[in-house]
Amino acid sequence: AEAVWTAYLNVSWRVPHTGVNRTVWELSEEGVYGQDSPLEPVAGVLVPPDGPGALNACNPHTNFTVPTVWGSTVQVSWLALIQRGGGCTFADKIHLAYERGASGAVIFNFPGTRNEVIPMSHPGAVDIVAIMIGNLKGTKILQSIQRGIQVTMVIEVGKKHGPWVNHYS
């Protein structure tokens, strides 16, 4: 059992390329940093894995379609949005996100767990920030992205709590 750090999340929803400048930022303390994550702030566009069956990102060939800076081919800073489970460990998911160029990994919990979050243990996958958020929050974000809404998240270090029991997958 180890202490766990919460994550402050500032999330925005925006319909891209509409010319409408109204973006709503929503601040909450709904995430927890992974036990092996750097305790750092990170920000970027949330990007789920490509393909309807790839949400768990357990296939090592999983890809992500990353948006680019306007008028260029330069990829923006992005955060992988991945669902817990599917037969692979947290470390597998976070390492895949890192290999694909993500600045961070946002793991959302299993269906049926509502807003429950757990401290992830992911030894060896320590290169990027990794947090867990609840299933309800993750599903809301995922459904928004699937409807063509661009979701941006700013993650900042919250408060120290604990100790909690670690989980590896």
């Epitope: 925005s12 925006r14 891209p16 390329h17 010319g19 400048n21 973006t23 930022w25 702030p41 990170v42 920000a43 970027g44 566009v45 948006p67 680019t68 800076v69 306007w70 923006v76 800073s77 600045s103 661009q150 941006t152 700013v154």
Partner: nanobody, 118 residues
């Protein structure tokens, strides 16, 4: 609305340096991003560099290692330090600002001329 005012352009010899500045005013969100594009005569406007949310920096391949973008959040100002300038860097440089995210069409400044002579 966002207003942008560039400065620092001019004439410089190849291999020299310039520093462009761009000050933003108006309705600016805490999360706004800023950057630079350029347009050479007879060519389309192209991306040069950007800095978003104060954390991530982006560069076009053609300027990587030579140009550095930075910002002063307290002054709502972005800077472009241009070193090892080449004649092909000659262009009008436009400041860009995004009220939301860098994937969107930005607001533009009026532009400042940079001429690199050989």
């Amino acid at each position: 609305q966002v207003q942008l005012q560039e400065s620092g352009g001019g004439l410089v010899q190849a291999g020299g340096s310039l520093r462009l500045s761009c000050a933003a005013s108006g309705t600016i969100s805490y999360y706004y991003a800023m950057g630079w594009y350029r347009q050479a005569p007879g060519k389309e406007r192209e991306f040069v560099a950007a800095i978003d949310l104060g954390t991530s920096t982006y560069y076009a391949d053609s300027v990587k290692g030579r140009f550095t973008i930075s910002r002063d959040n307290a002054k709502n100002t972005v800077y472009l330090q241009m070193n090892s300038l080449k004649p092909e860097d000659t262009a009008v440089y436009y400041c860009a600002a995004w009220s939301d995210y860098v994937t969107e069409l930005p607001y533009w400044g009026q532009g400042t001329q940079v001429t690199v002579s050989s």
